[in-house]
């Protein structure tokens, strides 16, 4: 018999490399049975996780799983860091593993490496 506990499916040590200026959606996969739990996102600051109160979030429902999405509109360089989602379910608090965003800030076209440089050292774009 399948468990009806709420489960948050963020993999341990998951990470995303993203670019400043782009839109991005950070997904928290949530499995539940009857009533959808109340889910929040927080950002790790040392040992505490600061709740993200005023950020745009949404739900995406799929057949066997739902996703609680944190929207970055757009990604800013200071969005770099680790995030965690938490679910409140029947007075229980369930916390996910943390997921880390590595944000690269590409400054301007004048700093873009040449095609030759890119061919030999493609990581230059992400300095």
């Amino acid at each position: 018999k399948e468990s009806c506990d709420v489960q948050l499916y963020i993999k341990r040590q998951s990470e995303h490399s993203i670019l400043a200026g782009d839109p991005f959606e950070l997904e928290c996969p949530v499995k539940y049975c009857a009533n959808r739990p109340h889910v929040t996102w927080c950002k790790l600051n040392g040992t505490t996780c600061v709740k993200l109160e005023d950020r745009q979030t949404s739900w995406k429902e799929e057949k066997n799983i739902s996703f609680f999405i944190l929207h970055f509109e757009p990604v800013l360089p200071n969005d770099n860091g680790s995030y965690r989602c938490s679910a409140n379910f029947q007075s229980n608090l369930i916390e996910s593993h943390s997921t880390t965003l590595y944000v690269t800030d590409v400054k301007s076209a004048s700093e873009r490496p040449s095609k030759d440089e890119m061919a030999s050292r493609p990581w230059l774009l992400y300095r």
């Epitope: 400043a20 839109p23 509109e73 400054k107 774009l125």
Partner: antibody
């Protein structure tokens, strides 16, 4: 070097649909961090951001005009097309195509094309 | 949407003058602000990005400062080619918004 050029009608009638094409060179819209956008400027007035297509395929629009705007890219032709439905005389403006890399500052601009909406 | 305001709306100055233009955001935008220069009949040109970063090819007499809600563009010694309209733009969040512009003309 990076260049962008706008093309399309200079005169459209009210209620018609405007289609503007931005043809660019010197970069690819499939390169990480790149975006191509549209900004307009009514005569004697300030700049207004309309839409932006990102290298990822994501698109963002000005909320006040979202229902009327569509931005599409043709990476193989190095073109981005903006369509704007239900044109009105208040949409009379110079329309600029712009390039961005990284954070959303517009570092290269086309020369602009003046679109007049009149019957 | 974040509203951007600029002051003054116009300024009359002479060659060699120091000119300061301010831009204010209706909410905090950290340092995600750009400044553009526009001459009549021409497209805008990016001068400053990230509040204080000088765009390549822009003369060093242009400088930007500020963070949060209050920003400044300074032209240390006005040159004849600097007579133009200047706009600020926030890049902190969609939709990107511009200030109403500041016209710098000859005294």
């Amino acid at each position: 070097q990076i260049t962008l050029k706008e093309s399309g009608p200079t005169l459209v009638k009210p209620t018609q649909t405007l289609t503007l094409t931005c043809t660019f060179s010197g970069f690819s819209l499939s390169t990480p961090a790149v975006g191509v956008g549209w900004i307009r400027q009514p005569p004697g007035k300030a700049l207004e951001w309309l839409a932006l297509e990102f290298w990822t395929g994501d698109k963002r629009y000005s909320p006040s005009l979202k229902s009327r705007l569509t931005i599409t890219k043709d990476t193989s032709k190095n073109q981005v097309v903006l369509t704007m439905t239900n044109m009105d005389p208040v949409d009379t403006a110079t329309y600029y195509c712009t390039h961005k890399l990284g954070m959303n500052y517009f570092d290269y601009w086309g020369q602009g094309t003046l679109v007049t909406v009149s019957s | 949407d974040i509203q951007m305001t600029q002051s003054p709306s116009s300024v009359s100055a002479s060659v060699g003058d120091r000119v300061t233009i301010t831009c204010r955001a209706s909410q905090g935008i950290s340092s995600w602000l750009a400044w553009y220069q526009q001459k009549p009949g021409k497209a805008p040109k990016l001068l400053i990005y990230a509040a204080s970063g000088l765009q390549s090819g822009v003369p060093s007499r242009f400088s930007g400062s500020g963070s949060g809600t209050d920003f400044t563009l300074t032209i240390s010694s006005l040159q004849p080619e600097d007579f133009a309209t200047y706009y600020c733009q926030q890049a902190n969040s969609f939709p990107f918004t511009f200030g109403p512009g500041t016209k710098v003309d000859i005294k």
